[in-house]
């Protein structure tokens, strides 16, 4: 996972409906000058990406870890 | 009846704030972001920035970002656009528009806005 | 800051005859391109999204086609109802900029 940024908010909808073991990828995207809040996409195993509230509890934690330290690109 | 239906005109002193309603109806508000765009007269047109509907969280250009808030009421499906520190540059025709609809699958081919209000005159003057 | 430039400033024609309005972006906006008509004292209407998709309730012949930074609307036969103003808009990034705007005018 990396701190990443997008050029406008990707995300105007959120789900929390996913298993953790669906996951293959997430995509932290950064509060930023394009887009005032935190996203987070994930890339499932099936192929498809979706949009995940960063305030899920099994995703904060995780959060948290990439953005205070994670591999950061811009 | 798919619409979005502003507040009416508003005469303000410079200085002074004007809030700006639009009423979103007959259709899915989380599913679109609204946008704000002003037009002075005989101008073009100008993106104030837009708010999430669902999280209510804004954007905003830069060149209004100390001036404008922008603020939604989902229990009336309500957006609302105040600027302060108004002086004569800012009059203008204030619109709302909507832009969507996107679902929580995350889009890079975005839509073009489809719905607009009918828009609100601010006059600033002393 | 994204900026997009429109040409021609005013475009003098007949009814009946094709026009053909220019719309380039300062650097990529992929087909993030949009065309909205407005006509005096009206709000700006979406004609084309996406560069070329159409939208429900516009006449055909109205389209739109383009990438990267140059993109074109074309109004393949002119009627009475199109003499306005023309301006493209991008979303690809935030923020949200519009042309200067093309005045459709009889000639």
């Known amino acids: 996972a990396a701190v990443l940024r997008e050029l406008r908010c990707v995300c105007l909808q959120t789900t929390q409906g996913v298993h953790p073991k669906m996951i293959s990828n997430l995509q932290v995207f950064a509060i930023g000058p394009q887009c005032s809040k935190v996203e987070v996409v994930a890339s499932l195993k099936n192929g498809k990406e979706i949009c995940l509230d960063p305030e899920a509890p099994f995703l904060k934690k995780v959060i948290q870890k990439i953005l205070d330290g994670g591999n950061k690109e811009n | 009846q798919v619409q979005l239906v502003q507040s009416g005109a508003e005469v303000k002193k410079p200085g002074a704030s004007v809030k700006v309603s639009c009423k979103a109806s007959g259709y899915e508000f989380t599913s679109y972001w609204i946008h704000w765009v002003r037009q002075a007269p005989g101008q073009g047109l100008e993106w104030m920035g837009n708010?999430?509907?669902?999280?209510?969280?804004?954007n905003y250009n830069e060149k209004f970002k100390s001036r404008v808030t922008m603020t939604r009421d989902t229990s009336t499906s309500t957006v609302y656009m105040e600027l302060s520190s108004l002086r004569s540059e800012d009059t203008a025709v204030y619109y709302c528009?909507?832009?969507?609809?996107?679902?929580?699958?995350?889009?890079?081919?975005?839509?073009?806005?489809?719905?607009w209000g009918q828009g609100t005159l601010v006059t600033v003057s002393s | 800051e994204i900026v997009l430039t429109q040409s021609p400033a005013t475009l003098s024609l007949s009814p009946g005859e094709r026009a053909t309005l220019s719309c380039r972006a300062s650097q990529s906006i992929s087909n993030n391109l949009h065309w909205y008509q407005q006509k005096p004292g009206q709000a700006p209407r979406l004609l084309i999204y996406?560069?070329?998709r159409s939208v429900s309730g516009i006449p055909a012949r109205f389209s739109g086609s383009g990438s990267g930074t140059d993109f074109t609307l074309t109004i393949s036969s002119l009627e009475p109802e199109d003499f306005a103003v023309y301006y493209c808009?991008?979303?690809?990034?935030?923020?949200?900029?519009f042309g200067g705007g093309t005045k459709v005018e009889i000639k």
């Open positions: 808009g991008q979303n690809n990034e935030w923020p949200e900029v």
């Open positions: 996406y560069t070329s």
């Open positions: 708010i999430s509907p669902n999280s209510g969280s804004a």
């Open positions: 528009a909507r832009e969507g609809p996107y679902s929580y699958y995350p889009s890079r081919q975005y839509y073009g806005s489809d719905l």
